[in-house]
Amino acid sequence: EKSDLRTVAPASSLNVRFDSRTMNLSWDCQENTTFSKCFLTDKKNRVVEPRLSNNECSCTFREICLHEGVTFEVHVNTSQRGFQQKLLYPNSGREGTAAQNFSCFIYNADLMNCTWARGPTAPRDVQYFLYIRNSKRRREIRCPYYIQDSGTHVGCHLDNLSGLTSRNYFLVNGTSREIGIQFFDSLLDTKKIERFNPPSNVTVRCNTTHCLVRWKQPRTYQKLSYLDFQYQLDVHRKNTQPGTENLLINVSGDLENRYNFPSSEPRAKHSVKIRAADVRILNWSSWSEAIEFGSDDG
């Protein structure tokens, strides 16, 4: 870590220290402590205060980003006196050198790509490194395969997501022989960054009066069940005039995904395709391959 930690403290110090790997703020235990609290204030003056038992001399911040710089503060009362200490945690390094435009997406249920751009003031020899920590086990994943642009890491490909949990902390550190490089960090929910595959096993069966479309929910990285899906069907009559509206049908996920619609014989040639989304986010997948039914002379 290249970040400077600067302490602002009265004479008798609590010796406050912060470990950015574990997000743990700790201080020297005081005898006969009656009250203690820790919190941080970010650049937007938002305060984050984790729960703390009275006899503890440390606290862990679960869901925080540090790249904009934060100030930690510890207050301890003992039966004799009160202690207060601030710890400044700046993002040291030249302004504008941190990775920017950072984003990640999960696809094909078990692959993830993260990409970023080099900072505008970063020197030519800058190199970036991605680390991911999950919220549960605090395990650190180092990027196994970097995507490069002229030798600089500008992305990462992961083909093993077993270390991730529902919410994860992403850190992009930078190094250079010339100057200090700022870091960038971000918290991402896997459910918000997953791009679903389209539904599979799409079939259409017709009788004299109706057609029944069936499909299977896509395999996903998240542990989703049938109610978590929303589907959209595009039933399209072939050889219609340009500008004719497609029929878009919304269908809630069910144990048996099916849509039955009236379509009497003789029926013109139609096509149907389906896409899927998380019912709460509606981040639509691409469309499935179009399935044709009916006949040209219908």
């Epitope: 529902s166 459910k191 542990k223 989703l224 069940s225 049938y226 109610l227 978590d228 144990l255 048996e256 019912v279 709460r280």
Partner: antibody, heavy 120, light 111 residues
Amino acid sequence: QVQLVQSGAEVKKPGASVKVSCKISGHSLSELSIHWVRQTPTKGFEWMGGFDPEENEIVYAQRFQGRVTMTEDTSIDTAYLTLSSLRSDDTAVYYCSIVGSFSPLTMGLWGKGTMVTVSS
Amino acid sequence: QAVLTQPSSVSGAPGQRVTISCTGSGSNIGAPYDVSWYQQLPGTAPKLLIYHNNKRPSGVPDRFSASKSGTSASLAITGLQADDEADYYCATVEDGLSGSVFGGGTKVTVL
């Protein structure tokens, strides 16, 4: 049409064990997550446990830990609940259910229930 | 004692609108976790009525709607019908606990 068919009512003595079955028809058990919930007039609904795909194992409610066992036989699409060391306050209707969503846990489809009476 | 608090009963005449409240705390509904609602007709198994706070499974009429705000949720039944006479339960999850927690249930009587 997916259905959950549960075994018949049971009368048991205190200290005994009971095994309730839940047969799934119209769908493969291997693609589903089955959870068990019981209902008593005094305590209402109590979640007992079920398959958690995140952990890839069956998880149990703390209060039933050590007394409850949930098993599955995917070859016959049947889930089982065994409750041991029965007490009179275990008298309840026991339901199996298919999870409709994991976040949060939502029971999408329920079996008809199995009445278990514990009486000396 | 149920983790979520519901009124023990509500009633209304046919065609009327009734609402059922479900009050939780900052460690369940307010955490925030989604709420689901179940209907249990006399002598039958529960049936899912609402999930993810306000979504209806296929086959549930749009006379049933629900909402959530802060640490409480509510279920509304409009155009009350005789066959709506049943017990209604809300459910969600609790911080630090696996599985579901339920309300004590509300008996809806159609006058």
